[in-house]
């Protein structure tokens, strides 16, 4: 009888099925929807989380101006195809043979086409801008306290290396968190900024992906930080390819 059998759950992903039937009675966890093995010592990839979600029962200006190439996830949820390592496949198609290309965070980066559409490579999202508006408070938060708290959150809760949190901007009531991670910077074992941003997004919405942990309780010097709006912009290493028709619509 092992410790694994007493607590066979996945701390970092509640959307898993776990059983103590791994080698030596170890706990083995697989993602809902895909059945893929999940490493419970780190964040699960966004692709596997989206797939699990779709399989589950239906329930002086200091702020950054997003570049003209920034993408926002307007398409919402879809059931993605993930590769054997749990990353998004570059080309995604729906049940009606409509296909499109996505970036490494699964956001569409081309016009939709048919089965002949080619997506040569999975383009990396290297810069993520998380734009938050907090609920009214008695006064503004202290910028350096806010900065420190958000950096601590990404380091401790999401296990994202501090060097990937590029900046925290604040202009009451807007907070912007910039995450940057080039292909060359990401070492084996590093949490991906796309995965960290997705966990954060779900936490902010009160839909924590962590097993058995309470929801996110963000406080700055004891003062609750309550978010009322979230927008996330994704910047890819190669700009997206949309037709002019979409850009002028």
């Amino acid at each position: 009888h092992t410790a694994a059998q007493d607590n066979c759950t996945c701390p970092t992903n509640k959307m898993t099925v776990c059983s103590p039937d791994g080698p030596g009675g170890r706990c083995q966890c697989r993602a809902l929807g895909s059945g893929m093995a999940v490493d419970c010592s780190t964040l699960t990839s966004k692709c596997l989380l989206l797939k699990a979600r779709m399989s589950a029962p239906k329930n002086a200006r200091t702020l950054v101006r997003p570049s003209e190439h920034a993408l926002v996830d307007n398409d919402g949820l879809y059931d993605p195809d993930c590769d054997p390592e749990g990353r998004f496949k570059a080309r995604q198609c729906n049940q009606t043979s409509v296909c499109w290309c996505v970036n490494s965070v699964g956001v569409r980066r081309t016009d939709k086409g048919d089965l002949s559409l080619r997506c040569d490579e999975l383009v990396r999202t290297h810069h993520i801008l998380i734009d938050l508006r907090h609920r009214p408070t008695a006064g503004a938060f202290n910028h350096s306290d806010l900065d420190a708290e958000l950096r601590r959150l990404f380091r401790e809760r999401y296990r994202l290396h501090p060097k990937f949190v590029a900046a925290v901007h604040y202009e009451q009531p807007t907070i912007q968190i910039e995450l940057r991670q080039n292909t060359s910077q990401k070492a084996a074992g590093d949490v991906d900024i796309g995965d960290a941003a997705y966990y954060f997004e779900r936490d902010i919405k009160g839909e924590s992906l962590f097993q058995g942990r309470g929801g996110l309780d963000l406080r700055v010097r004891g003062e609750p930080l309550q978010v009322e709006r979230t927008l996330i912009y994704y910047l890819d290493e190669i700009p997206p390819k949309f037709s002019m028709k979409r850009l002028t619509a």
Epitope: R26, C27, C40
Partner: nanobody, 121 residues
């Protein structure tokens, strides 16, 4: 880039034997734990053997214990699975996988494309 390439699969009669090989590259094989995982049609993946980095520790589920033997040659970056007394229920695609074992959890993080093993009666 991690690459795992299996070979040695095929069709065999009940009671027969096969030896699978897996050539590994793109990572320090001699310091990696490894597993063989199989997936039968319409079923989920199932690990069938595990070996630690230096080959001193192996594990098998009850379904294959005494029939399957996992081994490795770190000088050749190759993993092996010797399968004896094969049964129809051993029919599946067999993949080698890089694995990780902690005090409480087991996970595979990279897999090969797999080789088909068919046991006919």
């Amino acid at each position: 880039q991690v690459q795992l390439q299996e070979s040695g699969g095929g069709m065999v009669q009940v009671g027969g034997s096969l030896r699978l090989s897996c050539a590994a590259s793109g990572f320090p094989f001699s310091s990696a734990d490894m597993s063989w995982v199989r997936q039968a049609p319409g079923k989920g993946p199932e690990w069938v053997s595990y070996i630690n980095a230096d080959g001193s520790k192996t594990y098998y589920p009850d379904s294959v214990k005494g029939r399957f033997t996992i081994s490795r040659d770190n000088a050749k970056n190759t993993l092996y699975l010797q399968m004896n007394s094969l049964k129809p229920e051993d029919t599946a695609v067999y993949r080698c996988a890089r694995a990780k074992l902690t005090d409480t959890h087991y996970v595979e993080d990279y897999w090969g494309q797999g080789t088909q093993v068919t046991v006919s009666s």
